[in-house]
């Protein structure tokens, strides 16, 4: 019996087609992805093959103005239109709190939404009961397939799930659910979830009875043969893991942002054992037509976005200096504003010992592309912020050793004075440079804000200590020459859309007046 699994993950609000790098589509003839194009390909495959499941491994939420405006309603609407069969909850599905998941998505989705390792407690337990499930048995042709969901247990540090959801260890939570499916005579089981490729592989290895793992969170690109675009494969598609009980378990993921549609064909024997598996992600490039009816619907929903872009988010009573003459040479108040917003967006008081789990922010000055003049009645709009942060990036959470941070700050000024983008703006950090010293030895003081303290204060950076830092995904990926971050990071979790972080902060503060306050000094 053959099953075709079509899968997406980490779509992050890319409802419209995007450029090859998943930013805003500029030249339509070279654009990719989007739900209208995805629908075309899904429909083609459904037409051609008998047993097809369309699955999403989480993180539909967060990433473009679509999510900012529609807050998840767009996800439910278009996933319903594409007739998804199941979705796993990702960490970003909790970005607007549990209510922001329940109302727009859980109550509106016409497909099951899954996670076996999230347990509700207190008053939430009855409110959310039945709205998401640990597993679902789906009829496919003449057979049944069990789908069991899982979500990163780091979600409380990455999003806003509140205090009434407990995120258990994935493997511990999955095993009894899979066992339950086996007792129900379901012998074909897919683990669908959002914990990253390493955990996907562990699930394939450790959870008895799981036949296939469809994952997300780590934006992993797997491919067999010559890859069709810029993404470099982390391994073959599917990635085969030998389970502890000796089975070959295919593990798949389909990069991110709706750029690819994962396509996996599995052949099962009559006892539900995987005989063979093959496939590849399908690049959704512009040669695949956008479905006209879905496209028309997208255009209808778009109207509200255009209106939103020009509405006031808040006010500034000071000039927001985002000029390259400032931000690439010294502390600039636009850099301070953005870093403060980044930290504010990551306030998660999850432990009595810590006032917060993260206190530090770094931001490449070259990523700040425009100032905002306060003389326009102080008004700040989304459109203004899009000029400051035009690249459609995310502000991510990483874990780095102090020694890596020191290298990053040396890199920040290694060729100071040439208006290059690597000069770092900061938050929760006090740095002093001596430019008279040779490159690589210019950081004379580097103090960081404590987290394990009731009264935050600045202490010298410790080389062997592991620190959490919020930074642009561009830096996490080694951009602007920050190879040491990419090479030495110990953990990387993708965060919220950059503009969304700053806009939320401005809306929350209502009136802002960031200052230049001595975060960066020269001796």
């Amino acid at each position: 019996w053959e099953l075709t699994i079509l899968h997406t993950n980490d779509v992050h609000s890319r409802l419209e087609q995007t450029s090859e790098d998943s930013s805003k589509c500029v030249n339509a003839s070279r654009c990719m992805g989007g739900v209208a194009r995805l629908f075309t390909k899904v429909q083609q495959i459904r037409r051609a093959e008998p047993n097809v499941l369309l699955l999403d491994a989480g993180d539909q939420y967060q990433g473009t103005i679509w999510f900012t405006v529609y807050k998840g309603a767009e996800v439910a609407h278009f996933m319903n239109a594409l007739r998804y069969d199941a979705m796993a909850l990702g960490n970003h599905e909790f970005d607007n709190g549990v209510e922001g998941l329940i109302e727009p998505l859980l109550k509106e989705a016409k497909f099951p939404i899954l996670s076996a390792n999230i347990k509700a407690k207190g008053p939430l337990a009855s409110q959310i009961s039945g709205l998401y499930l640990p597993y679902k048995v789906l009829p496919v042709g003449d057979e049944v397939v069990g789908i069991v969901g899982y979500t990163s247990k780091e979600t409380p540090f990455l999003s806003n799930p509140g205090t009434n959801l407990v995120f258990e260890d994935e493997i511990t939570a999955l095993q009894p659910e899979v066992d339950k499916l086996k007792t129900l005579n379901v012998n074909k089981i897919i683990a669908l979830g959002h914990s990253g490729f390493e955990m996907d592989k562990l699930i394939a290895q450790k959870v008895r009875g799981v036949d296939v793992v469809v994952g997300g969170h780590s934006n992993t690109f797997l491919y067999t043969g010559n890859p069709p675009s810029k993404e470099v494969p982390a391994g073959k598609y599917p990635f085969i893991v030998t389970s502890d009980d000796g089975r070959k378990v295919p593990v798949v993921q389909a990069y991110a942002f709706g750029k690819y549609l994962g396509y996996l064909k599995i052949e099962f024997d009559e006892r539900g054992n995987v005989i063979s598996s093959h496939g590849n992600p399908i690049l959704l490039n512009s040669s695949i037509p956008e479905d006209p009816s879905i496209k028309a619907d997208i255009n209808k929903w778009r109207i509200k976005l255009d209106n939103y872009s020009t509405q006031e988010l808040g006010k500034t009573i000071v000039y927001l200096d985002g000029s390259s003459q400032s931000c690439r040479f010294r502390e600039c108040n636009m850099g301070n504003l953005i870093c403060d917003a980044m930290i504010n967006n990551n306030l998660r008081h999850t432990d009595e010992m810590f006032w917060n789990h993260v206190s530090m922010c770094i931001l490449n000055g070259g990523g700040i592309r425009s100032p905002i003049d306060e003389r326009n009645n102080g008004t700040i709009t989304w459109e203004n912020l899009a000029a400051v942060l035009p690249f459609g990036g995310t502000f991510d959470l990483v874990q780095l050793k102090g020694s890596t941070l020191k290298k990053a700050f040396e890199h920040s000024v290694h060729r100071y004075g040439q208006s290059t983008g690597e000069f770092l703006q900061v938050g929760g950090i006090h740095v002093v440079y001596d430019l008279s010293r040779k490159p690589g030895d210019r950081v004379v003081k580097l103090d960081v804000l404590c987290t394990k303290c009731r009264v935050p204060s600045y202490d010298p950076l410790k080389m062997d200590e592991v620190y959490k830092v919020i930074l642009p995904n561009f830096l996490a990926n080694g951009g602007d020459g920050f190879q040491m971050i990419k090479d030495e990071l110990l953990r990387h979790d993708s965060g919220d859309q950059d503009i969304n972080v700053v806009s939320t902060y401005i809306s929350k503060m209502k009136v802002i007046y960031p200052a230049v306050e001595g975060r960066i000094k020269f001796s």
Epitope: I45, Y263, S286, P289
Partner: antibody, heavy 121, light 107 residues
Framework: EVQLVQSGAEVKKPGESLKISCKGS????????LSWVRQMPGKGLEWMGE????????YYNEKFKGQVTISADKSISTAYLQWSSLKASDTAMYYC??????????????WGAGTTVTVSS | AIRMTQSPSSFSASTGDRVTITCKAS??????VAWYQQKPGKAPKLLIY???YRYSGVPSRFSGSGSGTDFTLTISCLQSEDFATYYC?????????FGGGTKLEIK
């Protein structure tokens, strides 16, 4: 090398049955769709229907539904077009054409050389 | 069924000429349009797929454009081997329909 090899020309009488074939080689037969296209003498192209040999799913142009049957034998990588009762108006050239539904070339990328069917009393 | 109206039905041109053939769909077909070349006694050959993508091995003088309902095939510098009949086809919805064809003849 991808090839679609069609069976030879046929001359038939009205009311007779006929089954013409199209054998695919040089590619995975079950991973592509196969269509049949009719071209009457001096006329244009008409899509008759298609089969996906991997699943056996068939789709017909309403105009030809009930008039012809499309089938495939994946064990020998061959698709068929058959008539149970031919009419003089079935006289035409019949082409099979391949369709890559997993790829992005929206069109028929390979065609057979065609099978001439002549129906005459 | 979606109708594909092709024009002109025939056209006389000389080698070196620039020739444009148009095709109009009766409803929005996005970019799901292909163009074929057929010579007498031969099977059609795919030239352009998805409205504007040149199929492998097709000379660069052939180009396609359009989306929605209006499509064009352009031959920038006509060669002697280009005299043939050209068909557009929509691949958006079944029944997949072809235009009536444009016969390109030597002037």
């Amino acid at each position: 090398e991808v090839q679609l090899v069609q069976s030879g020309a046929e001359v038939k009488k009205p009311g007779e049955s006929l089954k013409i074939s199209c054998k695919g080689s040089g590619y995975t037969f079950t991973s592509y769709g196969l269509s049949w296209v009719r071209q009457m003498p001096g006329k244009g192209l008409e899509w008759m229907g298609e089969i996906y040999p991997g699943s056996g799913n068939t789709y017909y142009n309403e105009k030809f539904k009930g008039q012809v049957t499309i089938s495939a034998d994946k064990s020998i990588s061959t698709a068929y077009l058959q008539w149970s009762s031919l009419k003089a108006s079935d006289t035409a050239m019949y082409y099979c054409a391949r369709y890559d539904y997993l790829g992005s070339s929206y069109g028929f990328d390979y065609w057979g050389a065609g099978t001439t069917v002549t129906v005459s009393s | 069924a979606i109708r594909m109206t092709q024009s002109p039905s025939s056209f006389s041109a000389s080698t070196g000429d620039r020739v444009t053939i148009t095709c109009k769909a009766s409803q929005d077909v996005s970019t799901a349009v292909a163009w074929y070349q057929q010579k007498p006694g031969k099977a059609p050959k795919l030239l352009i797929y998805s409205a504007s993508y040149r199929y492998s091995g097709v000379p660069s003088r052939f180009s396609g454009s359009g989306s929605g309902t209006d499509f064009t095939l352009t031959i920038s510098c006509l060669q002697s081997e280009d005299f043939a009949t050209y068909y557009c086809q929509q691949h958006y919805n079944t029944p997949y329909t072809f235009g009536g064809g444009t016969k390109l003849e030597i002037k």
